[in-house]
């Protein structure tokens, strides 16, 4: 199936109730087959995808989704108005920003229209299911001869996020990690001018506004050092894994080249 289904680390407040036909204990029929679990993720509080593994059904089935908010002004049952499909059958529902209420208990119900009593209800705390967009606009500043400061931006959710910075040099086999609170800056106090550094950042909706377990994607990496740091030692910004190599580096030809080409250029 083409639908991407993220698996959460678990939402401890999620509960599932199955309303099923009663059957003799020695006979498990299709009508009692549990429905797939619904996984919901709120992307940057812009929209929410609630998806399920449609191929776990015994045959292709257009399951239907309803939702409401428990004990709130929004407790009216709503039908999904924008289904997601895999292999021509429903495999998810997308809710828009205006339908998302982070701090009310979200109730989602999946149902088999061919077996109306075959339905499952889950309760979710949406503030624990937010996944922010990857950090953007990474920039590096040299604060002193040996100190670098990394800055970045997040779209809309700034104070609600914590961050994880990873960095390494070309000589390192693994990343060094550093947690950063809601401020989006990180200082590296001791930089070796002879090495080339790579930095990347990811963010999480935790702990000020929610308790999400899922990190954003990693930002595009940003690099510092090697030949380029000598050209402009006080400010060096790089985005989207591309780098401008100077004329002298390329024998008088200025050119935008990829990260792969860059590695080749520096090591040969």
């Amino acid at each position: 199936l083409n639908t991407t289904i993220l698996t959460p680390n678990g939402n401890e407040d999620a509960t599932t109730d199955f309303f099923l036909t009663s059957m003799p204990t020695d006979s498990l029929s299709v009508s009692t087959l549990p429905l797939p679990e619904v996984q919901c993720f709120v992307f940057n509080v812009e929209y929410m995808n609630c998806t399920w593994n449609s191929s776990s059904e015994p045959q292709p089935t257009n399951l239907t989704l309803h939702y409401w908010y428990k004990n709130s002004d929004n407790d009216k049952v709503q039908k999904c108005s924008h289904y997601l499909f895999s292999e021509e059958i429903t495999s998810g529902c997308q809710l828009q920003k205006k339908e998302i209420h982070l701090y009310q208990t979200f109730v989602v119900q999946l149902q088999d229209p061919r077996e109306p009593r075959r339905q499952a209800t889950q309760m979710l705390k949406l503030q624990n299911l937010v996944i922010p967009w990857a950090p953007e606009n990474l920039t590096l500043r040299k604060l002193s001869e040996s100190q670098l400061e990394l800055n970045w931006n997040n779209r809309f959710l700034n104070h609600c996020l914590e961050h994880l910075v990873q960095y390494r040099t070309d000589w390192d086999h693994s990343w060094t990690e550093q947690s950063v609170d809601y401020r989006h800056k990180f200082s590296l106090p001791s930089v070796d001018g002879q090495k080339r550094y790579t930095f990347r950042v990811r963010s999480r909706f935790n702990p000020l506004c929610g308790s999400a377990q899922h990190w954003s994607e990693w930002s595009h990496p940003i690099h510092w050092g090697s030949n380029s740091s000598k050209e402009n030692p006080f400010l060096f910004a790089l985005e989207a894994e591309q780098k401008l190599i100077s004329e002298e580096d390329l024998g008088g030809e200025q050119k935008l080249i990829s990260e792969e080409d860059l590695h080749h250029h520096h090591h040969h």
Partner: antibody, heavy 119, light 108 residues
Framework: QVQLVQSGAEVKKPGASVKVSCKAS????????MHWVRQAPGQGLEWMGW????????NYAKRFQGRVTMTRDTSITTAYMELIRLRSDDTAVYYC????????????WGRGTLVTVSS | EIVLTQSPGTLSLSPGERATLSCRAS???????LAWYQQKPGQAPRLLIY???SRATGIPDRFSGSGSGTDFTLTISRLEPEDFAVYYC?????????FGQGTKVEIK
């Protein structure tokens, strides 16, 4: 490697019952529906039903309901198909077939078990 | 239930020739849910095509599937000696799963 190994050929008398086994290996047994399909000599393929090893749920083709029982033993990753009140027209090769995890076609078949019903 | 009718019953061809097998459904089958299998004597069926046109892993590209709605086709562009066998179509979009009665491709 990924395979389904079925039990050996059986000869039964009319009215008797037969239980065919299908041992799965090389993949997560509980993650795939297991279907049973039969083929009478010189004939086409006939679907009999499925079992979901994860939960034990089953679904049988109408013509076999009341005569067929599909079970599984997850501890030995084996599925079983039992057919009772055998008749001569139940003489066939019985296949277990794994349903794909991504869709609903059969992507892996056992080699088949010949069941002969004769007085 | 959906009845699948295959034609012709037997196809007599020589190696190197093109084989065209037809499968017609009694009611519309979503193209996502039609498969073709090959079966040789004494062997289990083997998946060739799923979703009407997607080749299964390890299946040579001389095998291709097409069609939608009620009419589906399996084409073998150039028959190899090992392709002489019986071919079955199957719909898996609704229960009960059903198969066509098969087309035998034999050496002329």
């Amino acid at each position: 490697q990924v395979q389904l190994v079925q039990s050996g050929a059986e000869v039964k008398k009319p009215g008797a019952s037969v239980k065919v086994s299908c041992k799965a290996s090389g993949y997560t047994f509980t993650g795939h529906y297991m279907h049973w399909v039969r083929q009478a000599p010189g004939q086409g393929l006939e679907w009999m039903g499925w079992i979901y090893p994860h939960s034990g749920h089953t679904n049988y083709a109408k013509r076999f309901q009341g005569r067929v029982t599909m079970t599984r033993d997850t501890s030995i990753t084996t599925a079983y198909m039992e057919l009772i009140r055998l008749r001569s027209d139940d003489t066939a090769v019985y296949y277990c077939a794994r349903r794909s995890g991504r869709s609903w076609y059969f992507d892996l078949w056992g080699r088949g078990t010949l069941v002969t019903v004769s007085s | 239930e959906i009845v699948l009718t295959q034609s012709p019953g037997t196809l007599s061809l020589s190696p190197g020739e093109r084989a065209t097998l037809s499968c017609r459904a009694s009611q519309s089958v979503s193209s996502s849910y039609l498969a073709w299998y090959q079966q040789k004597p004494g062997q289990a069926p083997r998946l060739l095509i799923y979703g009407a046109s997607s080749r299964a892993t390890g299946i040579p590209d001389r095998f291709s599937g097409s069609g939608s709605g009620t009419d589906f086709t399996l084409t073998i562009s150039r028959l190899e000696p090992e392709d002489f066998a019986v071919y079955y179509c199957q719909q898996y979009g609704s229960s009960p799963w059903t198969f066509g009665q098969g087309t035998k491709v034999e050496i002329k």
